[in-house]
């Protein structure tokens, strides 16, 4: 549900297409100032289930760059960093939201779409044993 | 960098604020055809570092749902379904875009914003630091 | 030119045991995961046993727990299977196949095999 | 151990014609399906890896999808020299499971 009423100080808008098309302020507001994510950027070494990080570029875009992961392995990592064939890395994967220009090249306008990006990777059990 | 030459056939808009304000179409474009999200959807529960989803709820936002995972053990399950404190769980974590109504309860016009979401967790080695 | 080319088969009484070897060439043996997989006369494909890279993985599915150990001499770019205690359901043609990867998922490349005849 | 139910166990075919072959797994395998050719007296040849990704060299009318439990393997228009059994392979589980294989004749 995006559809709220409106304030008399909002900006104006014509209400035949609302809310089809809103202005976006691009002047990011960064809300993150209390975690500092790169606390995070090891895990993709050290994780039984640990993954590579490809560097996704599309100038059409905004974010222009994504960073998607692709698990290194298959099965899982032992702690004596051989492999458990009994145990399967997997991506996690998120949608998120980004910026697609339309039309193509123009700078001020946009339209929102829903991408699936992998994250990171996580080790699982390949079966589930189900209990009568 | 978001700035590319404009094609005639762009909407107009004043070079001066330009690219503070754009204008972004909300009907969105789902590129997911050929992947299915819900295919991961059981990995929170077959990880060797299983989370729960908390729903954050915020109608300033857009989305205004958004799903926050938070890991259920600080260290990490084994086969047996004990847990092996010698491992870490720990939350892989993700910048994304959302949208914030600017001003407040303004239905068309919104603030570009990252916020920090925590995806799923993993597994990883904990870092021992050795004493001299 | 990746090659895989077994050796050993033959045709042995039930109990007794048998050695294969499959001698690796054109490509970089020690960074590969290898397979044993085979086929009775007639039938589909099965698989017996995998190793890692480094040797210190392996895997055997249940009908040959037990009895049969895969190793490798990686000096040797040379993937071993020693099969124990052979039955007469063990008859088939043996091949050595390497996994794209490092650990023994899916095989890119095969040996032309090895026929292992149990019978008495 | 998961369960690869391939079929049909055999086909007869014209040059030209499209040629389809399923596989079905016990339960979801998570795309982790390959796909090999196996021509009489030789070794198997990896087609398709990770249920739809075409091995290099591999001929462009060979194609396999599908996700979860159900997978496609298909040939858009058969030629002579695909005459083979298929079978397709699980690695999302060990013990490794193949199907029971498909043979593709020419009519």
């Known amino acids: 549900g995006i559809a709220i009423p409106r304030n008399s100080g909002c900006p104006n808008s014509e209400d035949k297409n609302f809310p089809r098309t809103v202005m976006v302020n691009l002047n990011i507001h960064n809300r993150n100032t209390s975690t500092n994510p790169k606390r995070s950027s090891d895990y993709y070494n050290r994780s039984t289930s640990p993954w590579n990080l490809h560097r996704n570029e599309d100038p059409e875009r905004y974010p222009s760059v994504i960073w998607e992961a692709k698990c290194r392995h298959l099965g899982c990592v032992k702690a004596d960093g051989n492999v458990d064939y009994h145990m399967n890395s997997v991506p996690i994967q998120q949608e998120i939201l980004v910026l697609r220009r339309e039309p193509r090249h123009c700078p001020n306008s946009f339209r929102l779409e829903k991408i699936l990006v992998s994250v990171g990777c996580t080790c699982v059990t390949p079966i589930v044993h189900h209990v009568a | 960098g978001i700035a590319i030459p404009r094609n005639s056939g762009c909407p107009n808009s004043e070079d001066k604020n330009f690219p503070r304000t754009v204008m972004v179409n909300l009907n969105i474009h789902n590129r997911n055809t050929s992947t299915n999200p819900k295919r991961s959807s059981d990995y929170y529960n077959r990880s060797t570092s299983p989370w729960n989803l908390h729903r954050n709820e915020d109608p300033e936002r857009y989305p205004s749902v958004i799903w926050e995972a938070k890991c259920r053990h600080l260290g990490c399950v084994k086969a047996d379904g004990n847990v092996d404190y010698h491992m870490n769980s720990v939350p892989i974590q993700q910048e994304i875009l959302v949208l914030r109504r600017e001003p407040r309860h303004c239905p068309n016009s919104f603030r570009l914003e990252k916020i920090l979401v925590s995806v799923g967790c993993t597994c990883v080695t904990p870092i021992v630091h050795h004493v001299a | 030119e990746v090659q895989l080319v077994e050796s050993g088969g033959g045709v042995v009484q039930p109990g007794r045991s048998l050695r294969l070897s499959c001698a690796a060439s054109g490509f970089t043996f020690s960074t590969y995961g290898m397979s044993w997989v085979r086929q009775a006369p007639g039938k589909g494909l099965e698989l017996v046993a995998i190793?890692?890279?480094?040797?210190?993985?392996?895997f055997y599915p249940d009908s040959v727990k037990g009895r049969f150990t895969i190793s490798r001499d990686n000096s040797k770019n040379t993937l071993y299977l020693q099969m124990n205690s052979l039955r007469a359901e063990d008859t088939a043609v043996y091949y050595c196949?390497?996994?794209?990867?490092?650990?023994?998922?899916?095989?890119?490349?095969w040996g032309q095999g090895t026929l292992v005849t149990v019978s008495s | 151990d998961i369960q690869m139910t391939q079929s049909p166990s055999s086909l007869s075919a014209s040059v030209g014609d499209r040629v389809t072959i399923t596989c079905q797994a016990s339960?979801?395998?998570?795309?982790?399906l390959a796909w090999y050719q196996q021509k009489p007296g030789k070794a198997p040849k990896l087609l398709i890896s990770?249920?739809?990704s075409l091995e290099t060299g591999v001929p462009s009318r060979f194609s396999g999808s599908g996700s979860g439990k159900d997978y496609t393997f298909t040939i858009s228009s058969l030629q002579p020299e695909d005459i083979a059994t298929y079978y397709c392979q699980q690695y999302w589980s060990v013990p490794w499971t193949f199907g029971g294989g498909t043979k593709v004749e020419i009519k």
């Open positions: 339960e979801d395998i998570y795309d982790r």
């Open positions: 196949a390497r996994d794209p990867r490092h650990d023994g998922y899916f095989f890119d490349y």
């Open positions: 990770g249920a739809t």
């Open positions: 190793i890692n890279h480094n040797g210190g993985s392996t």
